[in-house]
């Protein structure tokens, strides 16, 4: 007997069949499964005769099915048993929630039956835009995923579906608004004093590796002061500021070198109670007086430091009551520059330091006695002395050989120079100087001086006179003259004077390019420290120009004749003869003769021909005047 067929749903896509039957009776069972509305062909299954139950998977969800079964015994079919049952509803996704929202990402969580889906299909769509949606799939075992790459402050619709091989669930949707891009937060100044301030700022934890704080005096181009602080800090004390000064403070967050845009705040440090107008004046040679101004009742005390400017020795420190506004500092070195600094102390704070420099007075003294501008009859004295102390200076002039009477001068204490004159030349002197003031006579200081010898300029000599010039020479004291002036004037004063300035070491001047055969006056004077000596004078006449003269023709022959002439002895280097027929029918003849010659036979001319003869001498490259003659050769 085959009986008790029961059908139960197995999930939303399958049914379970149970039946009873006699043991070991059936070879197999035939099961037919068909949709109740007969839309699709029936499914047939053959199962072993030993089974009493079977699962039928792969059915449609929420669908009524008719299930039939019969057994087969030795080829015979039993009567058919039938039953009706419906598959379950498709499993829906549970709940979808946005667990975390950032400005460029979010985390999506959802619930779903275990093992129901192969994967989930998620769609991320910007609300109210036609931009393509972002699609992604995640494995069916997941219930959470991160959705990165979103826009800040943007509405999104997120849809999720569960998917199996042949089925996709009804989508679940959720709306979400991404956060604004995170600002660094607020930057505030919570405490301001005259030299410091406290910064506070807000920012999400764990966002930044470090912060960079930049502190800059407003409207200053000086480099800003930078501080780097750990990313965990939210507060920072900024010390070392100037009182009463506007500052701009900026704060950057930083992640691996990437810097945020800055937060900025403007702040003005508090003013200090005024400490100002430090004045330092001398009190004698060994003390200084300090005066300063300060707000009343502001200061607990003042600290004054006195230090020699050029020494790193320990400074003198004084602490004075806050009520004082002046103090004398004795026991200092005379004539020494000091730097004096003062600061006030208010509630433990030091004010900025005021500094001034001043020197103690010199002990009255004289020094650096110098002799200058020595001449044969005078010299100048100069010296240094403490200003405003001396009434008079006494100068004594004594010749070293004690041959002359001592000369004494008293001059005003304001003077620092004296001109001593009326002295003999070439004399050694000792100069003594002392300063006098009430109850003071300084130590005497001294210097030596020797008046110069009178400079000699003498023995003006003229030599090497020739037609075009001459040599001027003279004698003078060694190292006595800075320069010499030589002036040359023609005796008739028809020409401009010629002036030659020569160095003080020269003793000779060669004059050239003068006019032959005229008188000249030569004057030589010397210069010493701008002073000119009276000139030495000499007169001289340049030689006449050397002449060639008396060109005579004699002893005419058919082919020539004899020429003779006169000339100044020892003047000419050579002579030049030019001979040419007067009708210019032949080439001219030019003959150069040596200086001693005064006669020359000319041959090789044409008979009975008239010739023109020219002769000139050459002296030091210059030509003399030409002399001419006419000569005729004899008939043949």
């Amino acid at each position: 007997e085959l009986e008790n067929l029961t059908v139960t749903e197995v999930g939303w896509d399958g049914l379970r069949l149970n039946w009873t039957a006699a043991d070991q009776a059936y070879e197999h069972f035939i099961i037919q499964v068909q949709e109740a509305n007969k839309v699709e062909a029936a499914r047939n299954l053959t199962v072993p005769g030993s089974l009493r139950a079977v699962d039928i998977p792969g059915l449609k969800a929420a669908t009524p099915y008719t299930v039939s079964i019969y057994g087969v015994i030795q080829g015979y079919r039993t009567p058919v048993l039938s039953a009706e049952a419906s598959t379950g509803e498709t499993p829906n996704l549970g709940e979808v929630v946005v667990a975390e929202v950032g400005w460029d990402a979010l985390k999506l969580n959802w619930t779903a039956p275990e093992g129901a889906y192969e994967y989930f299909f998620i769609q991320v769509q910007e609300a109210d835009t036609v931009e393509a949606a972002q699609n992604l799939t995640v494995p069916g075992g997941l219930r959470s995923t991160d959705l990165p790459g979103l826009k800040a402050a943007t509405h999104y619709t997120i849809t999720i579906r569960g998917v199996t091989q042949d089925f996709s669930t009804t989508p679940l949707s959720v709306e979400v608004l991404t956060e604004e891009v995170p600002d660094m937060g607020n930057l505030t100044v919570t405490e301001v004093s005259w030299d410091a301030l406290r910064l506070n700022w807000t920012t999400p934890d764990g966002t930044y590796d470090q912060f960079t704080i930049q502190v800059q005096e407003a409207d200053q181009v000086e480099e800003a002061h930078n501080l780097t602080v750990p990313g965990s800090l939210r507060s920072m004390e900024i010390p070392g500021l100037r009182a009463g000064t506007p500052y701009t403070v900026t704060l950057h967050g930083e992640v691996r070198g990437h810097s945020t845009r800055p937060l900025a705040v403007e702040v003005v440090t508090e003013d200090l109670p005024q400490l100002g107008d430090l004045a330092v004046s001398e009190v004698g040679w060994d003390g200084l007086r300090l005066n300063w101004t300060a707000a009343d009742n502001a200061y607990e005390h003042f600290v004054i430091q006195v230090q020699e400017v050029n020494k790193v020795e320990a400074a003198q420190n004084l602490t004075l009551p806050g009520s004082l506004r002046a103090v004398d500092i004795p026991g200092l070195e005379a004539a020494t520059p000091y730097r004096v600094s003062i600061y006030g102390v208010i509630r433990g704070y030091r004010t900025p330091v005021l500094s001034a420099e001043a020197s103690t007075a010199k002990e009255p003294e004289i020094g650096n006695l110098n002799v200058s501008d020595i001449t044969p009859e005078s010299f100048n004295l100069s010296w240094m002395a403490t200003d405003g102390i001396f009434e008079t200076f006494t100068i004594e002039i004594i010749d070293s050989n004690r041959l002359l009477e001592t000369v004494e001068y008293n001059i005003s204490g304001a003077e620092r120079t004296a001109h001593i004159s009326g002295l003999p030349p070439s004399t050694d002197f000792i100069v003594y100087l002392s300063g006098l003031a009430p109850s003071i006579r300084t130590k005497t200081i001294s210097a030596t001086a020797t008046t110069e010898a009178l400079p000699l300029l003498e023995n003006l000599t003229i030599s090497d006179i020739n037609p075009y010039g001459f040599t001027v020479s003279w004698m003078a004291s060694e190292n006595a003259f800075d320069s010499f002036l030589v002036t040359v004037v023609d005796s008739g004063k028809l020409l401009d004077p010629q002036e030659f300035t020569l160095s003080g070491t020269q003793r000779k001047l060669e004059l050239r390019g003068l006019i032959t055969g005229i008188g000249y006056e030569v004057m030589v004077s010397g210069f010493t420290q701008g002073h000119q000596t009276k000139p030495l004078r000499a007169e001289i006449v340049t030689e006449a120009e050397p002449e060639v003269d008396n060109l005579l023709v004699s002893d005419a022959t058919p082919d020539g004749f004899r020429l003779s002439w006169t000339a100044d002895e020892g003047v000419f280097d050579n002579f030049v003869l030019k001979i040419r027929d007067t009708k210019k029918q032949s080439e001219p003849l030019e003959i150069t003769l040596l200086a001693p010659e005064r006669t020359r036979d000319i041959t090789g001319l044409r008979e009975a021909t008239e010739y023109e003869i020219e002769l000139y001498g050459i002296s030091k490259g210059r030509r003399s005047q030409t002399v001419s003659a006419i000569a005729t050769t004899a008939m043949g």
Epitope: V181, T212, V255, R256, G257, H258, S259
Partner: antibody
């Protein structure tokens, strides 16, 4: 002079592993964060991973999270990238880069080529 | 998206001024960094922070930032400036992000 020299690239089959090294010199290695950046053939730059100077904090791109591990040995002045479960899309030139405070990725190595292909 | 968006290509005449731009939400908070890459070479940092140049980078390169946009300006472009330029910043998960790159051609 700062120098970064990558090595360890080569051909590997999909699913395989590779370890890249970056030898650093010319700066105090332990004081600086380091990064790996890759560039697929003909494509743009893609950041892969970063590590803090001490090695205590690490960061990964979503595309490599769970597959790649960045580390550094400050005693050897060397940065590493352990790459597992490699995919064809991981084929790229891999650069290591140094980061300074206030200056991101200021020095780069010359790169090493990783090819993932069967 | 949190990606940084760049124009794929820009050209400039020799000696003229060119601006390469980069857009993205992270640039509202962070300054962009800019990298130059020539074919076959590693990238080189040219601008970082508000407008800072590493040593050795010519002063014709400058950077600026406004809203969600960062710009790299080359004043008086030279032939040697022809390259790919990438912008770079940080996103909310402290990860670096790069723009897609801009190919600059100097004509």
């Amino acid at each position: 002079e700062v120098q970064l020299l990558e090595s360890g690239g080569g051909l590997v089959q999909p699913g395989g592993s590779l370890r890249l090294s970056c030898a650093a010199s010319g700066f105090t290695f332990s004081s600086y964060a380091m990064s790996w950046v890759r560039q697929a053939p003909g494509k743009g730059l893609e950041w892969v991973s970063a590590i803090s100077g001490s090695g205590g904090s690490t960061y990964y791109a979503d595309s490599v999270k769970g597959r790649f591990t960045i580390s550094k040995d400050n005693s050897k002045n060397t940065l590493y990238l352990q790459m597992n479960s490699l995919r064809a899309e991981d084929t790229a030139v891999y650069y290591c880069a140094k980061t300074s405070p206030r200056v991101p990725l200021d020095y780069w190595g010359q790169g090493t080529l990783v090819t993932v292909s069967s | 998206s949190s990606e940084l968006t760049q124009d794929p290509a820009v050209s400039v005449a020799l000696g003229q001024t060119v601006r390469v731009t980069c857009q993205g939400d992270s640039l509202r908070s962070y300054y962009a960094s800019w990298y130059q890459q020539k074919p076959g070479q590693a990238p080189v940092l040219v601008i970082y922070g508000k407008n800072n140049r590493p040593s050795g980078i010519p002063d014709r390169f400058s950077g600026s930032s406004s809203g969600n946009t960062a710009s790299l300006t080359i004043t008086g472009a030279q032939a040697e400036d022809e390259a790919d330029y990438y912008c770079n910043s940080i996103n909310s998960t402290r990860n670096e992000v790069f723009g897609g790159g801009t190919k600059l051609t100097v004509l």
